[in-house]
């Protein structure tokens, strides 16, 4: 792959970077005086970017990579929580390895928690990818959920839907999928806790408790779905909304709702 062009030097660390760019020239080699075909940036190893949540003990090193290519050579820059990330924003700074499309932060501390976004761009396009960093106390610790999951979904009537919840936990977590429901027209019980229905939980024939799949959805299944994860240290939960739409010119189909795992109970959320 081509080596990326170095952006402004303010992103470079003070320490040297031996593996920075070992190409003799970053210019395109032209043999026939024709310009190479432009290519917008693209990920060269997307499978190495699938792990978005990184829960790391204090003092360790974090390396985030966004291996990319494009023509002309794309530039690489990093944001923290959506804002420009400069070395003086953290004690010890950071290193950007342009040859390996990576950022390295040594000796992480709790204030390093946040979302780190790589932006790879050339004049023909821009791509970005966000990693979530949590600096944790070593195990045991509370469960940690990847930000943005589960994600809101809008689907057509009769579709299948998949919600995902990415969990980092030691000790072993207990995962529950809940749906807020109404009982006798009320969403809140007499004890002021919301009514929920348990759709799935780890330990009850759940091959993959981090994923909730709903088949042939009905309008009645619209609503808020909650991924609740707990261990003996604590708990965490995140929710998403399902909106089920139906074609405007189609009559409402007569379908019976059949919950996956019917158990009405009060649950604090």
């Amino acid at each position: 792959r081509p080596s990326p062009t170095l952006p402004e030097q303010d992103a470079l660390p003070s320490s040297e970077d031996d593996d920075d760019d070992d190409d003799s020239s970053s210019e395109e080699k032209e043999t026939d005086n024709t310009k190479p075909n432009p290519v917008a940036p693209y990920w060269t190893s997307p499978e190495k970017m699938e792990k978005k949540l990184h829960a790391v003990p204090a003092a360790k090193t974090v390396k985030f990579k966004c291996p990319s290519s494009g023509t002309p050579n794309p530039t690489l820059r990093w944001l923290k929580n959506g804002k420009e990330f400069k070395p003086d924003h953290r004690i010890g700074g950071y290193k950007v390895r342009y040859a390996t499309w990576s950022i390295i932060m040594d000796s992480v501390v709790p204030s390093d928690k946040g979302n780190y976004t790589c932006i790879v761009e050339n004049e023909y396009g821009s791509i970005n990818h966000t990693y979530q960093l949590d600096v944790v106390e070593r195990s045991p610790h509370r469960p940690i959920l990847q930000a943005g999951l589960p994600a809101n979904k809008t689907v057509a009537l009769g579709s299948n839907v998949e919600f995902m919840c990415k969990v980092y936990s030691d000790p072993q977590p207990h995962i529950q999928w809940l749906k807020h429901i109404e009982v006798n027209g009320s969403k809140i019980g007499p004890d002021n806790l919301p009514y929920v229905q348990i759709l799935k939980h780890s330990g009850i024939n759940s091959s993959d408790a981090e994923v909730l799949t709903l088949f042939n959805v009905t309008e009645a299944q619209s609503g808020e779905y909650v991924c609740k994860v707990s261990n003996y240290i604590g708990e965490a939960n995140q929710s998403a909304w399902l909106t089920v739409t139906r074609p405007a010119l189609e009559e409402r189909p007569a379908v019976m709702t059949s919950p996956l795992y019917l158990e009405h109970h009060h649950h604090h959320h």
Epitope: A59, R97, S139
Partner: antibody
């Protein structure tokens, strides 16, 4: 400058408990570091045993976890290793070390022999 | 658990370049550190974070890390470089530190 010094018995009987202490001088054990133990059997390679943070949080090598306890004494600026149910296979030079992601400072090492 | 594989020995003539490899599954995603150990002495860090050198380590020592292999390169090898060399990572998946088996560098 920070220095590390291991101390403890050089001879331990089989089935007994190996106990070593590492004194940290010239710096605070409450810094943002992990305080580790690494061993090296005669003529063999390095083996990470485990480590502790000043908060008391620990991590151990899975192969030794059932026998290892690492503790920290902030008032004395030192940390300790206990390895129970030792056998001749535990004979090694034991190093204490300071670490972040890597080990940047090592003690000189102490040879512990397990023998009756 | 994560495994790091090093060649048991590497031989090189003085003035030549020695390359010591450290193999591991997708090791390029980890930060690799290298230590030199001479007989009867504690290990000394020679490269950290794949390619950085601590102060006092000669420029002849360099490192790289990509894919499934990290490499320690010693250029213009001297007799005093004869030692055992170990690679090490903190495996972020298991939250454990791992050493390679070590490579004995012999200067011919």
């Amino acid at each position: 400058q920070v220095q590390l010094q291991e101390s403890g018995p050089g001879l331990v009987k089989p089935s007994g408990t190996l106990s070593l202490t590492c004194a940290v001088s010239g710096g605070s054990i409450s810094s943002n570091n992990w305080w580790s133990w690494v061993r090296q059997p005669p003529g063999k390679g390095l083996e990470w045993i485990g480590e502790i943070y000043h908060s008391g949080s620990t991590s151990y090598n899975p192969s030794l976890k059932s026998r290892v306890t690492i503790s920290v004494d902030k008032s004395k600026n030192q940390f300790s290793l206990k390895l129970s149910s030792v056998t001749a296979a535990d004979t090694a030079v034991y190093y204490c070390a300071r670490a972040t992601d890597w080990f940047d400072l090592w003690g000189q090492g102490t040879l512990v022999t397990v023998s009756s | 658990s994560y495994v790091l594989t090093q060649p048991p020995s590497v031989s090189v003539a003085p003035g030549q370049t020695a390359r010591i490899t450290c193999g591991g599954n997708n090791i390029g995603s980890e930060s690799v550190h290298w230590y030199q150990q001479k007989p009867g002495q504690a290990p000394v860090l020679v490269v950290y974070d794949d390619s950085d050198r601590p102060s006092g380590i000669p420029e002849r020592f360099s490192g790289s890390n990509s894919g499934n292999t990290a490499t320690l390169t010693i250029s213009r090898v001297e007799a005093g470089d004869e030692a055992d060399y170990y690679c090490q990572v903190w495996d972020s998946t298991s939250d454990h530190r791992v050493f390679g088996g070590g490579t004995k560098l012999t200067v011919l």
